[in-house]
Interface confidence: low
């Protein structure tokens, strides 16, 4: 096979968080982040190679304690395919409850053209520290 | 490509437990742990092949309840490159808050000679149970 | 190498939860789940190719809040080899404490014929939502 498509993204909050959608970025200005194959479109990741992918994410809430987290509950993170609309689905969902970090991963088939979106619902802001909040994919097999 | 370099390590508290650095070990005496390519140096993992790696970790605190965890907050786990000094960086960081286990993973480029260190700051002890605390890397692509 | 063996499973609660063993399923009726190589036997995953595997899991408790989780503590999730008996071992263990989701992953050697079992001890029920509870393996190397 050719080199597997991979990406590791950092949070790129260039505008006030008016909507729950997290916008991601990659490149030297954003720590050790990169895209090898997939592309970023308006802060979302677009897949360019069909196959089975390992999708992983970690999100840490900024200025957070277990008290903050429980007070502002529910704070939920969801990763899904948001376009094309015909393939829209939630792939991964976690709530923060009394914690300030969620981290998970899953294997899922993705198709060329699928765009992945990550939504953080609730009132708390995500941390932009490069070792606390990141999102990535790794192509595993056709 | 040659077989990908991989390692899965268990906690090996053979040195004073007085500094925050966790020391790891591998081999038959330590459960299902091994190193295939990377090497252990004084309990830290040294990379021997350039490339993109999936780094994963789970750490469980010993003799812990949510009350203990919140009382002893902040307890934080960080994984980073600690040498060479010129490449020193924190790759992954999580706090325990009211939980007794953290687990996460990320894709990150590593170079031959990079040494990975894991620091558990705070006052609680990590569990040495082989199914509760482990740390590993998997080479993914050049 | 041939295509790596992989599986991503969804919870398949077709019988009342009388015992702590979670039963898994795959296929179109259960979201984006599949088996490529490993096989399901009575809701457990049977390995058909020797090698090193990345095992990952996420389990979310149904109708759960941090209060529920702490009230019903201990609720613990364990993944292990349950047969053949000679290879029986716990590979991965996490407690929920005050959270409603656990997620983790680890590298572990598995052999053809190994059957993986997942046990959820405690009184709370797991969520069957396909984006909240899943279990998978990915062959990494021989």
């Amino acid at each position: 096979h050719p080199e597997p498509h991979t990406a590791e993204l950092q949070l790129n909050l260039t505008v006030p968080r008016k909507d729950p959608t997290l916008r991601w970025g990659a490149g030297p200005a954003l720590g050790r982040s990169f895209t090898h194959g997939p592309e970023l479109e308006e802060g979302h990741l677009r897949i360019h190679q069909d196959g089975l992918y390992m999708v992983h994410i970690q999100v840490t809430l900024a200025i957070c304690s277990s008290t903050t987290a429980s007070r502002h509950h529910p704070t939920t993170l969801a990763v899904g395919i948001c376009s094309p609309a015909s393939r829209s689905i939630s792939l991964l969902r976690l709530s923060f409850h009394q914690g300030c970090t969620i981290a998970s991963q899953r294997l899922t088939p993705l198709a060329r053209g699928d765009t992945l979106c990550t939504n953080l619902t609730g009132t708390l802001l995500p941390s932009r520290n490069t070792d606390e909040t990141f999102f990535g994919v790794q192509w595993v097999r056709p | 490509h040659p077989e990908p370099h991989t390692a899965e390590l268990q906690l090996n508290l053979t040195v004073p437990r007085k500094d925050p650095t966790l020391r790891w070990g591998a081999g038959p005496a330590l459960g299902r742990s091994f190193t295939h390519g990377p090497e252990l140096e004084e309990g830290h993992l040294r990379i021997h092949q350039d490339g993109l790696y999936m780094v994963h970790i789970q750490v469980t605190l010993a003799i812990c309840s949510s009350t203990t965890a919140s009382r002893h907050h902040p307890t934080t786990l960080a994984v980073g490159i600690c040498s060479p000094a010129s490449r020193s960086i924190s790759l992954l960081r999580l706090s325990f808050h009211q939980g007794c286990t953290i687990a996460s993973q990320r894709l990150t480029p590593l170079a031959r000679g990079d040494t990975l260190c894991t620091n558990l700051t705070g006052t609680l002890l990590p569990s040495r149970n082989t199914d509760e605390t482990f740390f590993g890397v998997q080479w993914v692509r050049p | 190498h041939p295509e790596p063996h992989t599986a991503e499973l969804q919870l398949n609660l077709t019988v009342p939860r009388k015992d702590p063993t979670l039963r898994w399923g795959a296929g179109p009726a259960l979201g984006r789940s599949f088996t490529h190589g490993p096989e399901l036997e009575e809701g457990h995953l049977r390995i058909h190719q020797d090698g090193l595997y990345m095992v990952h899991i996420q389990v979310t408790l149904a109708i759960c809040s941090s209060t529920t989780a702490s009230r019903h503590h201990p609720t613990t999730l364990a993944v292990g080899i349950c047969s053949p008996a000679s290879r029986s071992i716990s590979l991965l263990r996490l407690s929920f404490h005050q959270g409603c989701t656990i997620a983790s992953q680890r590298l572990t050697p598995l052999a053809r014929g190994d059957t993986l079992c997942t046990n959820l001890t405690g009184t709370l029920l797991p969520s069957r939502n396909t984006d909240e509870t899943f279990f998978g393996v990915q062959w990494v190397r021989p």
């Epitope: - | 053979t14 004073p16 007085k18 003799i63 006052t123 609680l124 002890l125 040495r128 | -």
Partner: antibody, heavy 122, light 111 residues
Framework: EVQLVESGGGLVQPGGSLRLSCAAS????????MNWVRQAPGKGLEWVSD????????YYADSVKGRFTISRDNSKNSLYLQMNSLRAEDTAVYYC???????????????WGQGTLVTVSS | QAVVTQEPSLTVSPGGTVTLTCGLK?????????PTWYQQTPGQAPRLLIY???TRHSGVPDRFSGSILGNKAALTITGAQADDEAEYFC??????????FGGGTQLTVLG
Amino acid sequence: EVQLVESGGGLVQPGGSLRLSCAASGFTFSVYYMNWVRQAPGKGLEWVSDINNEGGTTYYADSVKGRFTISRDNSKNSLYLQMNSLRAEDTAVYYCARDAGYSNHVPIFDSWGQGTLVTVSS
Amino acid sequence: QAVVTQEPSLTVSPGGTVTLTCGLKSGSVTSDNFPTWYQQTPGQAPRLLIYNTNTRHSGVPDRFSGSILGNKAALTITGAQADDEAEYFCALFISNPSVEFGGGTQLTVLG
């Protein structure tokens, strides 16, 4: 209820040996670090030694290093202190103490036995 | 001579407040010394009160509190009671791998 019961103390001549035992009950002995702490008559406390939960790692105070050996038998829920080359200044009540596990840096003793008296005198 | 210093004795009236301190012969005590406090009544084993500067052990009444005051660790008892009469030992982490205990403070509750 956590219980620690020491035994094996007594009168011994300088240069002699004694073996102290501590029987533990009421908790999962095999997950706790264990310690010996001593208290000379009318004096303060002195940490002597500790051993990790699996028995593979031991530490000693400088005053007893090379003379005392701490060990444990998790199958018997027992802690031991082998004391050789005893000196007059080793005279003390010896306590078996459980490390709470609250600290990755320093032993914190949350349960103690009632102690056993060791007298080193000619 | 002791590295960890404590007042040899202190007196308090019932219902009163008293502060016991724990210092270093040379240098200041900080939270990095993980100050721990134990109570010992005559003929009994010590009992853990406070650890990691200010965390009360389970079952310890909230009239006992720990802190850093200036360059010393402190144990404060508010609303002293007759059964608080005991010897109090502090312990500090100074160097690997041990803890160093102070000489103890004999607290008398007058009344």
